[in-house]
Interface confidence: medium
């Protein structure tokens, strides 16, 4: 289970039209459910139940986004429509280039994602928890546009903001 280095990039424009980017670094883990490789894309927050619908019309997203899913306590969803692995597969089928699960409230999902799969996904499936998950969800919940950059080695530059 390798460390996944995740950079969340925010973009801020001003009336003059110039942009500043703000980068927040956090760490997660690559799960065995997916590949250990880098990925980048715009964050799309997905509700776990939103991944249940198998309707083709629900395929709303363009290819190349990073799905962020906050898993709920198992008691709140005792008979899930899909396993956690199934949800990751569904997101990738819909065009996700990577999936990040916040497992803080459902730590059992870690074992589910790390069970040796005969057919692992070809895209990374990362899980985060604790302070890193709080940091991620705080950005995802409050900001309009954010990009996630997932790497399997530490980013070269410090995670401070820089002008573009």
């Amino acid at each position: 289970k390798e460390t996944a280095f995740v950079e969340v990039v925010l973009f801020e424009s001003s009336p003059s039209g110039d942009y500043t980017t703000y980068t927040t670094g956090l760490t997660g883990r690559f799960s065995r459910a997916g590949a250990t490789l880098s990925a980048e894309g715009e964050i799309v927050q997905m509700h776990p139940l939103g991944l249940c619908n198998n309707n083709d019309e629900e395929d709303l997203y363009e290819y190349g986004w990073v799905g962020v899913v906050k898993l709920e306590q198992p008691e709140l969803d005792p008979k899930p429509c899909l396993t956690v692995l199934g949800k990751a597969k569904r997101a990738v089928q819909r065009g996700a280039t990577a999936v990040i699960f916040d497992v803080s409230e459902n730590p059992e999902a870690i074992d589910q994602l790390n069970q040796g799969s005969e057919d692992p996904l070809k895209r990374p499936v990362v899980y985060v928890k604790g302070a890193d998950a709080i940091k991620l969800m705080n950005i995802v919940n409050k900001q309009k546009v954010a990009r996630a950059r997932i790497q399997h080695r530490p980013p070269r530059q410090p995670t401070e903001y820089f002008d573009m």
């Epitope: 925010l10 973009f11 801020e12 424009s13 001003s14 009336p15 942009y19 500043t20 703000y22 715009e42 964050i43 799309v44 927050q45 709303l60 997203y61 363009e62 986004w65 919940n141 409050k142 900001q143 309009k144 546009v145 954010a146 903001y161």
Partner: antibody, heavy 123, light 112 residues
């Protein structure tokens, strides 16, 4: 010029669902987020959520989570807001409002607004 | 979540006189880029809201220069230098820093 044209007034019974449309014209539809804001009779403005027409990504106000769904049809440049399990307190004028252009993570700015759609929930 | 509070809630004004509306946020709206993420909207009777001021002090396109916005951090003010009959309506401040977006309760400006 930029225009947002909303669907007509609706009368619904408690427990039913309503789907309001907002057709955009005069600009590149996929480049601008769309928000929904509602206003109960004689009350102030309440933000309901947004949809990114490019990715389809959404963000909803916490108090509406699970009851509201925002979708879009890029072929007709139309966004939709569906509210389910309606109750009397959902009686309001529902507005769509276009956000500003660009990749700004925050700095939300609503301009222009649709003409509004009155949804009445009554038994 | 950020909470917005406006005062007064009702503002009777004589045409030609100045008017001032206050808006306070529960946390600072000053972004690290130096801009205050606070907008003002006007909803005229029977109409949809319209953008007046964005980022604290920038007038939206077509807004007369008698309207001005000021303030920083948590305290903001909308001023109308000389009120005209067409300015009647409800004025709302809105924090545009982060979701969930929040409006003030509104200030109803009416002509005396």
């Amino acid at each position: 010029q930029v225009q947002l044209v909303q669907s007509g007034a609706e009368v619904k019974k408690p427990g039913a669902s309503v789907k309001v449309s907002c057709k955009a014209s005069g600009y590149t539809f996929s480049r601008y987020f769309m928000h929904w804001v509602r206003q109960a009779p004689g009350q102030g403005l309440e933000w309901m959520g947004w949809i990114n027409p490019n990715s389809g990504g959404t963000r909803y106000a916490q108090n509406l989570q699970g009851r509201v769904t925002m979708t879009r049809d890029t072929s007709t440049s139309t966004v939709y807001m569906e509210l389910s399990s309606l109750r009397s307190e959902d009686t309001a004028v529902y507005y769509c409002a276009r956000d500003q252009k660009g990749k700004s993570s925050s700095w939300f700015r609503f301009d222009p607004w649709g003409q509004g759609t009155l949804v009445t929930v009554s038994s | 979540d950020i909470v917005m509070t406006q005062s007064p809630l009702s503002l009777p004004v004589t045409p030609g006189e100045p008017a001032s509306i206050s808006c306070r946020s529960s946390q600072s709206l000053l972004h690290s880029n130096g801009y205050n993420y606070l907008d003002w909207y006007l909803q005229k009777p029977g109409q949809s809201p319209q953008l007046l001021i964005y980022l604290g002090s920038n007038r939206a396109s077509g807004v007369p220069d008698r309207f001005s916005g000021s303030g920083s951090g948590t305290d903001f003010t909308l001023k109308i230098s000389r009120v005209e009959a067409e300015d009647v309506g409800v004025y709302y401040c809105m924090q545009s820093l982060e979701a969930p977006l929040a409006f003030g309760q509104g200030t109803k400006l009416e002509i005396k």
